[in-house]
């Protein structure tokens, strides 16, 4: 299986569904197909209201039954642990793969949690996180934000992934914007020396 490194915002925007859910047990092989499915308990939907329509929730997450076909293998045995699942909708079913952005909710920084609930959506369809995996790399468009975590940190999990979103600054320009407290806030006043 091959997976491209993915910024959380890209995962959010490229997914049909983003939910919080708990895995309820071991996967069940679906006979005569190349799939298995995990029973899940959805606790919150963060993206996908339009795509889903009347559906109130998803009982199963479908994934290829083989790792070579990018099948997802759920390793946690803790049924009370809540996961963020960014998946695709196919024939009315939630599909996930080994490449899906799928992490324990508590592993996300508060800034990322807030972004999945609210902020990332503002960049979808407008801005593009453009991966820089080898130097030199340059922006191809003003709507792109250059993602350099792989170069600078040697990993897709870096400062831009954890703390920034690529958002419209104006109709023609996207820039990295800090997800936490404003970086431009004034410093506390220095105490006068005695």
């Amino acid at each position: 299986c091959s997976c491209a490194p993915t910024h959380p915002q890209t995962a959010f925007c490229n997914s049909d569904l983003v939910i919080r859910a708990k895995f309820m047990g071991s996967p069940e092989i679906i006979e005569t197909t190349l799939y298995q499915r995990y029973e899940i308990k959805m606790t919150k939907m963060l993206k996908g209201f339009d795509a889903v329509g009347n559906a109130t929730g998803f009982r199963f997450a479908y994934t290829p039954a083989m790792e070579s076909l990018c099948g997802y293998v759920h390793k946690s045995q803790n049924r009370s642990e809540e996961f963020l699942i960014a998946g695709r909708l196919r024939n009315g079913n939630l599909h996930i793969t080994a490449c899906s952005f799928l992490v324990p909710w508590h592993n996300l920084s508060p800034a990322q949690q807030k972004a999945f609930v609210k902020t990332y959506s503002a960049g979808c369809g407008v801005c593009t996180v453009f991966p820089c995996s080898a130097i030199p790399c340059k922006l191809e468009s003003d709507s792109h934000c250059l993602w350099t975590d792989q170069i600078l940190m040697g990993s897709e999990k870096g400062y831009q992934s954890d703390h920034f979103a690529c958002l419209p600054r104006n109709p023609d320009l996207c820039t990295w914007q800090y997800l936490g407290v404003s970086m431009t806030r004034s410093l506390p006043l220095a105490k006068a020396e005695a």
Epitope: L34, M66, S68, C70, G71, R90, T97
Partner: antibody, heavy 121, light 110 residues
């Protein structure tokens, strides 16, 4: 690097049997599905079936179920496609290819060079 | 099998851009999000050019690009060159995970 090497061209008469092969190298042969694809002269690609050499789990396209047999010998990293009784309409180029996952996609990422089978009286 | 429909032939002059379409029959949401494209020169094995609608494997020219709108995926070749003359096939997979091919499109470079 990943390589799939197929057996050579075959000329057969109707009613004869045939077994063609596809040897994999450069990757873990038992961990990936191998598919067989038919291309009749001047026509498009048709998926025939796939096999998982690790446990010989085999799935056939409905169009080819009962017409051919797909097998594998994992000890020599080789997959096979065989006919018990050939027909003139089996004349075609046959490709083996590795069935693989890319992100959410399922596709054939590496192909053998093809085996031309000619059936004529 | 699910039918993926492609035009039988397209043509273009060197330097031009051409687009080949691949239409699925299902209207299910995301039913054809997953489309790959193969190039096949006469007498040769197919070669993967695009996967997951718009991604290029390493080594494939950036003149090749993929996109999707509604139920139709498209392969666009810009700056057409003589060596692009070949047959092109789209491929997806059905709800069981099994592969499905389009009928193929013959590209002629005039």
């Amino acid at each position: 690097q990943v390589q799939l090497v197929q057996s050579g061209a075959e000329v057969k008469k109707p009613g004869e049997s045939l077994k063609i092969s596809c040897k994999g190298s450069g990757y873990s042969f038992t961990s990936y599905w191998i598919g067989w694809v038919r291309q009749m002269p001047g026509k498009g690609l048709e998926w025939m079936g796939i096999i998982y050499p690790g446990d010989s789990d085999t799935r056939y396209s409905p169009s080819f179920q009962g017409q051919v047999t797909i097998s594998a010998d994992k000890s020599i990293s080789t997959a096979y496609l065989q006919w018990s009784s050939l027909k003139a309409s089996d004349t075609a180029m046959y490709y083996c290819a590795r069935y693989y996952g890319f992100e959410y996609d399922l596709l054939f990422d590496n192909w053998g060079q093809g085996t031309l089978v000619t059936v004529s009286s | 099998d699910i039918a993926l429909t492609q035009p039988a032939s397209v043509s273009g002059s060197p330097g031009q851009s051409i687009t080949i379409s691949c239409t699925g029959t299902s209207s299910d949401v995301g039913g054809y999000n997953y489309v790959s494209w193969y190039q096949q020169h006469p007498g040769k094995a197919p070669k993967l050019m695009i996967y997951d609608v718009s991604n290029r494997p390493s080594g494939v020219s950036n003149r090749f690009s993929g996109s999707k709108s509604g139920n139709t995926a498209s392969l666009t070749i810009s700056g057409l060159q003589a060596e692009d003359e070949a047959d092109y096939y789209c491929q997806s997979y059905d709800i069981s995970g099994y592969p499905v091919f389009g009928g193929g499109t013959k590209l002629t470079v005039l």
